[in-house]
Amino acid sequence: MKVLQEPTCVSDYMSISTCEWKMNGPTNCSTELRLLYQLVFLLSEAHTCIPENNGGAGCVCHLLMDDVVSADNYTLDLWAGQQLLWKGSFKPSEHVKPRAPGNLTVHTNVSDTLLLTWSNPYPPDNYLYNHLTYAVNIWSENDPADFRIYNVTYLEPSLRIAASTLKSGISYRARVRAWAQCYNTTWSEWSPSTKWHNSYREPFEQHHHHHHHHHHH
């Protein structure tokens, strides 16, 4: 039994780091393998992660962590019974994939304005709480070409757009994801999408132009 692709890990910079690797053949990850991890710090105990299968020869392990600081470094040991298959280390701050934002809501009760709000996925004591920026994706369920991205580069988890920038009388969906420049993170996963029916009263003189819209990237 050998490791074909060494473990690579990403951290949510709060409580979970996820490591994935591939073996050289079909493996029952949970019964045959164990990933031991230990913070390089005083008093730290070794923890055992039981991997799950991720495709025939792939394994994935979710490492639970109480907290995280920038300087953290973990030792990783992959065992098959008494045999050490691989030894490595992992610095969570260098491989961050933020948690996905949640609670995306579209408020349509403001006259001719759409207000999208969502929740920051981190508590205030986490460094990323004040360092996330967001991308909001809005698309039409009726027209695949009507797809746009709004970059939210301020800290407030909200976006205001004029309802008239979208077509009236059709349904739209929105979703949001996050990243943090400070740790050069990857993008988070998208939040669950939310749906609303876009309707607004157009001034008569704009009526013939309501199909025009801009794509934002």
Epitope: S15, I16, V40, F41, L42, L43, D67, V69, S70, P123
Partner: antibody, heavy 116, light 112 residues
């Protein structure tokens, strides 16, 4: 041996500023959060705030926002807390504590007395 | 802010007898990572506080097994199965789950 050694007692006049230090040995403060805890004479423990020494990220209890400023110097392995606009109610023992992720190591405390 | 309320505020116990201290939080102290950072500290006379229990039930290294922690949600308890003379001091519960972190007001244990 792990130790947090704090600076000595201070006596200050109302309105003054004081800066107390906490030097760590036996570990690197970059590997922990450094917290400060207040204990007024004959009273209980009160959390002031904390710093991540690597990036300088601080959070404070709202009561101490504007009163306390926590800093750290990773080159000397030392955390600091400055208390400004001192008043008699700031008279207390202030403890530095390392948390990873619980308060395992405490400094001996620094008594700050505010008196005219 | 989460208020941590300890009862009783003082306790007088005969050596060898059990003691129990309750700590109630004003709201849930489950952290967003799923853990409950409820800790117990003992401050002996003239000393800095020392850690006894972390994450509700875990004894810190070197802490005698006569100390135990229990509880969940908003109700937590520290028990000393047989009090010894060296256990005198003030016991504090602490929540490190939500900012601002908060201590209970303390329970003074003395020996009869």
């Amino acid at each position: 041996e792990v130790q947090l050694v704090q600076s000595g007692a201070e006596v200050k006049k109302p309105g003054a500023t004081v800066k107390i230090s906490c030097k760590a040995s036996g570990f690197n403060i970059k590997d922990t959060y450094m917290h400060w805890v207040k204990q007024a004479p004959g009273k209980g423990l009160e959390w002031v705030g904390r710093i991540d020494p690597t990036n300088g990220y601080t959070i404070y209890a709202s009561k101490f926002q504007g009163k306390a400023t926590i800093t750290a110097d990773t080159s000397t392995n030392t955390a600091y807390m400055e208390l400004s606009s001192l008043r008699s109610e700031d008279t207390a023992v202030y403890h530095c504590v390392s948390r990873r992720p619980w308060f395992a190591y405490w400094g001996q405390g620094t008594l700050v007395t505010v008196s005219s | 802010d989460i208020v941590m309320t300890q009862t009783p505020l003082s306790l007088s116990v005969t050596p060898g007898q059990p003691a129990s201290i309750s700590c109630r939080s004003s709201q849930s102290i489950v952290h967003s990572n799923g853990n409950t950072y409820l800790e117990w500290y003992l401050q002996k006379p003239g000393q800095s506080p020392q850690l006894l229990i972390y994450k509700v039930t875990n004894r810190f290294s070197g802490v005698p097994d006569r100390f135990s922690g229990s509880g969940s949600g908003t109700d937590f308890t520290l028990k000393i199965s047989r009090v010894e003379a060296e256990d005198v001091g003030v016991y504090y519960c602490f929540q490190g789950s939500h900012v601002p972190y908060t201590f209970g007001q303390g329970t003074k244990l003395e020996i009869k």
